[in-house]
């Protein structure tokens, strides 16, 4: 609940956002959650603490890890957790979906698509954008403050957006990019009855006591842009929210927009340390839209790790 | 707008608890810690403890502790606050009063007046 | 606890006047990240107080430009500027630097 995900690429500069919001925040401190040890505010180290923000000028692939901070108030102080990854650059042109930001969706009245996290940085215009790796060009693309304005959209303008920025830091200059995927609403869309592909009814999921374990709750709600749809996890009935176990988390996955056009949307459960008491709950994937609700229920059940011996027996 | 209604005004005998409701409307309930804070006729204003409703983590004033507990129910975005063993002295106005993310006391409850008489 | 000193405990004025109040802390309430933990708050009878200064001179969301603030880390002073009718209520500083929130005993604005 108090952990976010955030990434980059290496050279550039990444910036993060605490996940906790102070209530009022008087300070944060920052720390390396595996060492505990604080990280500095002096400006002159390449990564640094900023109150609410961590920056990494330019960002490694030694950086990533998990970043603890503590936002503090005379009152009550509130810890978050920041997982950092940081990726080598490709060489081709091709974003892994692990680097995509969230799909955004343009019509012909609406095709406004923002770059994603740049209110965190300290950026001048202009912005620049790429379709595809390709530089953007012709009178139809309008890069406005932080968004890339789209006229007379077709739907041959789907694809992946980056946007590129330069983030400024005391006369020093870095590079930012983040892409993200734009689809183009077919106003021929319709809605279903939600339909569960994973997991599948009463699924039993393998997993190994003091490992991690993911599950993926994937749905699908009809085709092009739909108007209400959610998918999420459920412990023994309970918001995982309101369940109250740190270990479990869940975590927006990809939007997803088939070849067929199908929308479908996937919520990964994440069980840090897999214990035995994991495995006496009820984990409930819920799919649902404005026609109703579908629920699938899986169970955990302890995997029995190889014996190695009784191979050569 | 951001809105904070308490219950009405309650008359109780020396020793008795008396439990005062808040409830939020306007903002996000676990977004806001909420304060409590008495006023006695004719007096100041004196702190008396808060809760962060997202976690039910609550902190109180030495003056009140051990008589008074502060609760939260997200779920109605209600605070309350329940004071023991009445004494006269305890006569008083008691207000909620919600923080925002830059200072506490921004928005306040209309007051409950609490009479403790025998 | 931080000791909050207000003065006067009352003071007659007319519409119109220049009105000054003083807040004393016992301590400097001025936190390591450079803020001055200083509020305002106005009451009028029967009512709740409402927030004027937060953070020693920023003026809350709809009040007057005729109220300001000023101060160093222990000695503060609540101006307003030229007294209206709706001004007459009790105005009282606070600390929230550190637990417990302490109060002044506040001061009393009348109509002369």
């Known amino acids: 609940k108090f952990s976010k995900q955030s990434w980059g690429l290496e050279n550039e500069a990444l910036i993060v956002r605490c996940p906790r919001q102070g209530k009022p925040s008087y300070t944060v401190d920052w720390y390396y959650s595996q060492t505990n040890k604080s990280i500095p505010t002096q400006e002159r180290n390449r990564v640094f603490a900023s109150g609410q923000l961590l920056k990494f000028l330019p960002a490694a692939v030694a950086d990533s890890g998990i970043y603890t901070c503590i936002v503090r108030s005379p009152t009550f102080n509130r810890t978050g957790y920041a997982n950092v990854t940081i990726y080598k650059k490709q060489s081709d042109c091709n974003v892994p979906d692990y680097l995509m930001y969230s799909t955004v969706s343009g019509s012909e009245k609406n095709s406004k698509i923002y770059c994603p996290t740049i209110d965190l940085y300290n950026w001048t215009a202009p912005l620049e954008w790429f379709k595809n790796c390709q530089a953007l060009q012709g009178s139809r693309y309008r890069a406005h403050k932080s968004f890339l304005v789209i006229d007379n959209v077709m739907t041959e303008d789907a694809g992946d957006y980056t946007c590129k920025f330069i983030h400024n830091e005391n006369g020093a200059n870095y590079s930012v990019t983040a892409t993200r995927s734009f689809t183009v609403k077919d106003e021929q869309g319709f809605s279903l009855f939600p339909v569960i592909g994973a997991p599948a009814q009463n699924e039993i999921k393998e997993v190994e006591i003091g490992k991690n374990a993911n599950l993926t709750c994937s749905a699908c709600f009809g085709k092009g842009t739909q108007f209400l749809a959610a998918v999420l996890w459920q412990l023994n009935g309970t918001k995982i929210t309101d369940f109250g176990e740190p270990r479990i988390q869940q975590e927006e996955g990809q939007n997803q927009s088939f070849s067929n056009g199908l929308a479908c949307l996937d919520m990964v459960l994440r069980i840090a340390d897999v214990k035995e008491e994991d495995l006496l709950l009820q984990y409930d994937c819920l799919a649902l839209n404005l026609h109703g609700l579908r629920r699938h229920t899986v169970r955990l059940s302890r995997k029995n790790p190889i014996d190695h011996h009784s191979i050569y027996c | 707008q951001v809105q904070l209604v308490q219950s009405g005004a309650k008359v109780k005998k020396p020793g008795a608890t008396v439990k005062i409701s808040c409830k939020a409307s306007g903002y996000i309930f676990i977004d806001s810690e909420m304060h409590w804070v008495q006023q006695a006729p004719g007096k100041g204003l004196e702190w008396m403890g808060a809760?962060?409703?997202?976690?039910?983590?609550?902190v109180y004033a030495k003056k009140f502790k051990g008589r008074v507990t502060i609760t939260a129910d997200k779920s109605s975005s209600t605070a309350y606050m329940e004071l023991s063993s009445l004494r006269s002295e305890d006569t008083a106005v008691y207000y909620c009063?919600?923080?925002?993310?830059?200072?506490?006391?921004?928005?306040w409850g209309q007051g409950t007046l609490v009479t403790v008489s025998s | 606890d931080i000791q909050m000193t207000q003065s006067p405990s009352s003071l007659s004025a007319s519409v119109g006047d220049r009105v000054t109040i003083t807040c004393r802390s016992s301590k400097s309430l001025l936190h390591s990240n450079g803020i001055i933990y200083l509020y305002w708050y106005q009451q009028k009878p029967g009512k709740a107080p409402k927030l004027l200064i937060y953070?020693?001179?920023n003026l809350a969301s709809g009040v007057p430009s005729r109220f300001s603030s000023s101060g160093s880390g222990t000695d503060f002073t609540l101006t307003i500027s030229s007294l209206q009718p709706e001004d007459f209520a009790t105005y009282y500083c606070?600390?929230?630097?550190?637990?417990?929130?302490?109060f002044g005993q506040g001061t009393k604005v009348e109509i002369k």
């Open positions: 009063t919600g923080s925002t993310t830059d200072y506490y006391f921004a928005y």
């Open positions: 809760i962060d409703p997202e976690t039910g983590d609550t």
């Open positions: 606070a600390q929230n630097l550190e637990l417990p929130f302490t």
């Open positions: 953070q020693l001179s």
